[in-house]
């Protein structure tokens, strides 16, 4: 039995996968910040996790996915105020009793040191210094990401 948050995450991810693949993104759009091969957008407003997920989707992006501790640190370095929390694309899957990224992969326990409980309706936020489990209904800011994928590295069939 999937929770409503899990369903929302799966629905949005599936709809993103159905869309026609666009040409690679060479530069970050206005107001987005480049971090290595990604463009990040830090919201100014606050929303619950599922609204944040939906907002990133409308921007043809996703909530932030963090590959490893190194990427976490570099992302945290972009956060100017240590008191501010941002949603990322990680929430607790009740059916699988594990932290699950919105791309369907599970959290490697070594990647993030999460403060707080792993339980139903828990979603992950990051601050300048830490990673927290919060109720998904909490209204905080969020980070969207777009992958920078240079066109010259893309291989399209029938081209």
């Amino acid at each position: 039995q999937k929770s409503s948050i899990e369903k929302c995450s799966v629905d949005i991810q599936q709809s993103r996968n159905k869309t026609t693949e666009r040409p690679g993104l060479l530069n970050c759009p206005i107001y987005w910040q480049q971090l290595r091969e990604k463009c990040l957008l830090f919201s100014h407003t606050v929303n619950p996790w599922n609204n944040s997920l939906a907002d990133c989707s409308t921007k043809e992006s996703s909530l932030l996915l963090i590959r490893d501790k190194d990427e976490l640190i570099h992302t945290q370095n972009l956060i100017r105020d240590k008191a501010i929390l941002f949603w990322i694309g990680l929430n607790f899957s009740l059916s699988e009793k594990n932290w699950k990224w919105i791309n369907g992969s599970f959290l490697n326990s070594n990647d993030l040191e999460i403060r707080g409980d792993a339980k139903e309706n828990s979603c992950i936020s990051i601050s300048q210094t830490s990673v927290y489990s919060e109720y998904c209904s909490t209204e905080i800011r969020w980070i969207c990401q777009k992958e920078l994928t240079p066109v010259r590295n893309k291989v399209y069939p029938d081209s």
């Epitope: 100014h44 407003t45 606050v46 929303n47 609204n51 939906a54 989707s57 409308t58 043809e60």
Partner: antibody, heavy 117, light 110 residues
Framework: QVQLQESGPGLVKPSETLSLTCTVS????????WSWIRQPAGKGLEWIGR???????NYNPSLKSRVTVSVDTSKNQFSLKLNSVTAADTAVYYC???????????WGQGTLVTVSS | QSALTQPPSASGSPGQSVTISCTGT?????????VSWYQQHPGKAPKLMIY???KRPSGVPDRFSGSKSGNTASLTVSGLQAEDEADYYC??????????FGGGTKLTVL
Amino acid sequence: QVQLQESGPGLVKPSETLSLTCTVSGDSFSSYYWSWIRQPAGKGLEWIGRLYTSGSTNYNPSLKSRVTVSVDTSKNQFSLKLNSVTAADTAVYYCARDPLGSFFDYWGQGTLVTVSS
Amino acid sequence: QSALTQPPSASGSPGQSVTISCTGTSSDVGGYNYVSWYQQHPGKAPKLMIYEVSKRPSGVPDRFSGSKSGNTASLTVSGLQAEDEADYYCSSYAGSNNVVFGGGTKLTVL
């Protein structure tokens, strides 16, 4: 170049509903937020409300009970409805692009709405 | 009553510098680095001049600069030119997804 164009009646009777539409061209409509702002003659600016193209909205607390902002993404349009208007609602109404939720980088030219019987 | 307080007027001669202040509280200006400034000529729509306290959109001359200290933000126009004569409004994020404006300052180039 991003362009915004407000449209709607210039005269509304007291106690009725003010309705305006903003048409956006020249940009990815769904990638931004969109706001309504008003300015009474000779006075300052007042933020009315914001629309996320995902469908959620935020409103100025002082107007929240009377305001609805909605979207038609297929037409690249968003709308304002302000009910139970009085003469104090007479103003130039602007629509604006609201990139991150705290500032407005492109504005419509504004439309004057007068509330009078 | 505007949420943010600006002086009603400011003036300077061509070539001089003028600073316009915008005072709020710890719930708006002091609490967030999300202050913006707008220029409005008579009968025209406002134009964004500064956002996030000190960032300038492309096309805005570098004569315009923004800063913040505590609960007060400032817009400085250096090397004043005749076309800078306009009304200037500050704005700030105010928490709970709300945005507030100042009452405006009329800048006169003498």
